[in-house]
Interface confidence: low
């Protein structure tokens, strides 16, 4: 009995996953199915044999990448009754050709928060641009947009941030760059001085549990689809 | 098939007070995956965000509009609200109410996935 | 400097293809974007989440024809089999520290 690779899929309430499975080489039916509590058998949810089960449909699409050898399984609308485990497979039988364990995990008991990261390849003199922006965190009621930041919720004491009023206009079709709050143009700062801003201004937000556990939300731990890492400068 | 149906007046006097609704059908408004949020569009310009709120009534506003900008929202009418006051003729544009949804792939972020059709507001006397 | 550059227009027949670019500044080229598309007299829609290496997210029942790819800062969204609906004004937006829902001014595009 072979030990079958296992993955760990987050997502939020109303929002949607892609499961990324492993696609075989000889061409048979390939399905994501789910295991059924006490049972253990696996039902399938949908596969390539135009099979889509009744709670699932209109909001599961599975699509093959044969030169990638891959296929994809994306759930959208998520519910807190689509947590649970999950397998990809090939093959006529769903219970026999398993290939991959899929853990899904729907979370909607936190907060979602802006959550700022440092930007390593930004040179220093780049003034912030803003349209339409945040402060870092405007007061204790006022924004902050991006998932999870650490700690406990409730009293976060106010930053008052002054901000310029001038309305930029926006018609030579492109975003200008401006200042951010204070009277001082703000700009980028070297990634060492950026990371202990950015670090200063997490203890300053609304803060959630689990910081770790929410900031993987979508990711797959194994098999990261796509090349992208922290790099990319946006929480 | 989540849908937001705005309303308010499509004329407000100067140093008046800007209300419009969005109500909410196909999601609850206090859906914790969610924010609702409202943009602007002056004609001939590019859209500023206004603000958000979140599905315990936290707020979040511009900080140019925000000692002008409230925000409520209503659970059991599923609708989410804005006011604006002191409304001059800069104020004149198509507010939009939206849906943002937190989404990570590799990295996280916000997006838009509804919009609402626009409500076109004249500040003029 | 700005964060996000579009061309301010674009045209393309019938049943052909497009491709509309949305250029990062520098020291943004690693940033992700998205694509919302905002036809005549409509609010915006959004179409897609576009990351760096070129793989992309599309909103709910956003057709197959539209399709996101990026070249180092560019950002590209590309129409194939234009449809006279596809007339709008596309823009593109990003985010990251201390910017947020930075819009570019945005293309219009003309279906000949």
């Known amino acids: 009995l072979r030990i079958l690779p296992e993955v760990k899929v987050e997502g939020e309430l109303g929002g949607s996953v892609t499961i990324k499975c492993p696609l075989p080489e000889m061409h048979v039916r390939i399905y994501l199915c789910r295991e059924m509590a006490g049972s253990g058998t696996c039902g399938t949810v949908v596969s390539t044999t135009n099979f889509i089960k009744a709670e699932y449909k209109g909001r599961v699409t599975l699509k093959q990448y044969p030169r990638k050898n891959l296929f994809l399984v994306e759930v959208t609308q998520l519910t807190e009754s689509d947590s649970g485990v999950y397998a990809c497979g090939a093959g006529m039988n769903t219970d026999r050709g398993k290939t991959q364990k899929v853990t899904l995990n729907v979370h909607s008991e936190y907060e979602p928060s802006w959550e700022e990261q440092p930007m390593p390849e930004t040179p220093k003199w780049f003034h912030l641009p803003y349209l339409f922006q945040m402060p870092a965190y405007a007061s204790s009621s006022k924004f902050v947009t991006r998932v999870t930041t650490p700690a406990q919720r409730g009293k976060v004491p106010p930053v008052h941030h002054s901000s310029p009023t001038t309305q930029i206009t926006h018609r030579p079709r492109v975003s200008r760059a401006s200042s951010v709050a204070g009277d001082k143009p703000r700009t980028f700062l070297p990634s060492t001085t950026a990371s202990k801003i950015s670090a200063l201004e997490g203890l300053l937000k609304p803060q959630t549990p689990s910081y770790n556990h929410h900031t993987r939300l979508h990711r797959q731990r194994a098999l990261d689809y796509g090349s992208q890492s922290g790099r990319e400068g946006q929480g | 098939q989540v849908q937001l149906q705005q309303s308010g007046p499509g004329l407000v006097r100067p140093s008046e007070t800007l209300s419009l609704a969005c109500s909410v059908s196909?999601?609850?408004?206090?859906?914790?995956?969610?924010?609702w949020g409202w943009f602007r569009q002056s004609p001939g310009q590019g859209l500023e965000w206004i603000g958000c709120i979140y599905a315990n009534g936290r707020t979040y506003t511009n900080p140019s509009l925000k000692s002008r900008v409230s925000l409520s929202i209503d659970q059991s009418r599923q609708r989410f609200s804005l006011n604006l006051t002191s409304a001059t003729a800069t104020d004149t544009a198509v507010y939009y109410c939206v849906r943002l949804v937190p989404k990570r792939t590799a990295t996280l972020h916000y997006y838009i996935d509804v919009w609402g059709k626009g409500t076109t507001v004249t500040v003029s006397s | 400097q700005s964060a996000l550059t579009q061309p301010a227009s674009a045209s393309a027949s019938l049943g052909a293809s497009v491709k509309l670019t949305c250029t990062l500044s520098s020291g943004h080229s690693s940033y992700a974007i998205a694509w919302h598309q905002q036809q005549p007299e409509k609010g915006p829609r959004y179409l897609m989440k576009l990351n760096s290496d070129g793989s992309h997210s599309k909103g709910n029942g956003i057709p197959d024809r539209f399709s996101g790819s990026s070249s180092g800062a560019e950002r590209y969204l590309t129409i194939s089999s234009l449809q006279s609906e596809d007339e709008a004004d596309y823009y593109c937006?990003?985010?990251?520290?201390?910017?947020?829902?930075?819009f570019g001014g945005g293309t219009k595009l003309t279906v000949l």
């Open positions: 937006q990003t985010w990251g520290t201390g910017i947020h829902w930075v």
């Open positions: 196909g999601a609850l408004v206090t859906n914790t995956a969610y924010y």
